[in-house]
Interface confidence: low
């Protein structure tokens, strides 16, 4: 490494683009797990990804800070991208979540290692 520049931490977390396929898959997986664990009658989906980072280890650790919004899709209805967000004040609900997802791309597996959410 050049003088005056600290060596990059090998395997340290680095910023990632939300457009990356791996990040998109990790996001979909995390939001899916969030909905699965939630007893809310409405599905939630990502309003925005505030920050995305990844760490190359044996697989890939994704660290995602996500703002979630409550949609009008209920119960057995698909959790699809075209579900509009609630706009009624009494039904509107946002959550801010930090997800850590461990992906092993060559195995096609993902695990939600950490998930902390709070109402926004």
């Amino acid at each position: 490494s050049s003088p005056g520049k600290p060596p990059r931490l090998v395997g340290g977390p680095m910023d990632a683009s939300v457009e990356e396929e791996g990040v998109r898959r990790a996001l979909d997986f995390a939001v899916g797990e969030y909905n699965k664990a939630s007893n809310d009658m409405y599905h939630s989906r990502a309003l925005q990804v505030v920050r995305a980072r990844k760490q190359i280890v044996a697989g890939v650790n994704y660290f995602l800070d996500v703002e979630l919004g409550r949609t009008t899709c209920t119960k057995t209805q698909p959790n699809l991208d075209n579900c509009p967000f609630h706009d009624q004040p009494h039904l509107k609900r946002k959550a801010f979540c930090s997800f850590q997802i461990y992906a092993v791309p060559w195995q096609g597996t993902m695990t939600l290692s950490k998930s902390t959410c709070q109402d926004a």
């Epitope: 899916g32 699965k36 009658m41 009008t72 899709c73 209920t74 119960k75 057995t76 209805q77 698909p78 959790n79 699809l80 075209n82 509009p84 609630h86 706009d87 009624q88 039904l91």
Partner: antibody, heavy 113, light 107 residues
Framework: QVQLQQPGSELVRPGTSVKLSCRAS????????MHWVKQRHGQGLEWLGN????????NYEENFKTKGTLTVDTSSSTVYMHLSSLTSEDSAVYYC??????WGQGTTLTVSA | DIQMNQSPSSLSASLGDTITITCHAS??????LGWFQQKPENIPKLLIY???TLHTGVPSRFSGSGSGTVFTLTISSPQPEDIATYYC?????????FGAGTKLEIK
């Protein structure tokens, strides 16, 4: 309390069209997608399509795309299903359901000469 | 389209029995599955959503389980008022599809 009001029955001639209504009350109309489900006599349930009353967004079962159209009148909290080119195969009970939580009593459609 | 294969098509149970109805999805639907009850000459009623969450007001003798492609509806000690046809429905993707139904009779 929540109510979905549907006409009890409709009798129409083959080849004509019909507009079935579903009037919602007792909840925020835009809170639920409205689905339509068909049930022929003694048969199972068949999902036809749905509409989001807030945006007018629709989804249809593939075969239903050439048969029906779903529309919304937010001023009267009513969802409509327009069925065209009716045949005896369209004779059935048609239910509207808000998010599968609340169901109308169903409209019995009879297509007969 | 996702096919929902429901079995058995009919069954007869006694009051003390535990009965199980199975639904097989033709592809992975995660937990996006609902169970409906339709009593004779009546409208359908949602019993369970998200595979295992009991809908408001549904008796606890009803329970649901499963994820992926195999799901079950269990009724512990069915009551005479449980005489009905039960349908599963997938909500993973459009078009939404129902199983063909299971008709329950009480001996």
């Amino acid at each position: 309390q929540v109510q979905l009001q549907q006409p009890g029955s409709e009798l129409v001639r083959p080849g004509t069209s019909v507009k079935l209504s579903c009037r919602a009350s007792g909840y925020t109309f835009t809170s639920y997608w409205m689905h339509w489900v068909k049930q022929r006599h003694g048969q199972g349930l068949e999902w036809l399509g749905n509409v989001d009353p807030g945006s007018g967004t629709t989804n249809y079962e593939e075969n239903f795309k050439t048969k029906g159209t779903l529309t919304v009148d937010t001023s009267s909290s009513t969802v409509y299903m327009h069925l065209s080119s009716l045949t005896s195969e369209d004779s059935a009970v048609y239910y509207c359901t808000a998010g599968f939580d609340y169901w109308g009593q169903g409209t019995t459609l009879t297509v007969s000469a | 389209d996702i096919q929902m294969n429901q079995s058995p098509s009919s069954l007869s149970a006694s009051l003390g029995d535990t009965i199980t109805i199975t639904c097989h999805a033709s592809q992975n639907i995660n937990v996006w599955l609902g169970w409906f009850q339709q009593k004779p000459e009546n409208i359908p009623k949602l019993l369970i959503y998200k595979a295992s969450t009991l809908h408001t007001g549904v008796p606890s003798r009803f329970s649901g389980s499963g994820s992926g492609t195999v799901f079950t509806l269990t009724i512990s000690s069915p009551q005479p008022e449980d005489i009905a046809t039960y349908y599963c429905q997938q909500g993973q993707t459009y078009p939404l599809t129902f199983g063909a139904g299971t008709k329950l009779e009480i001996k």
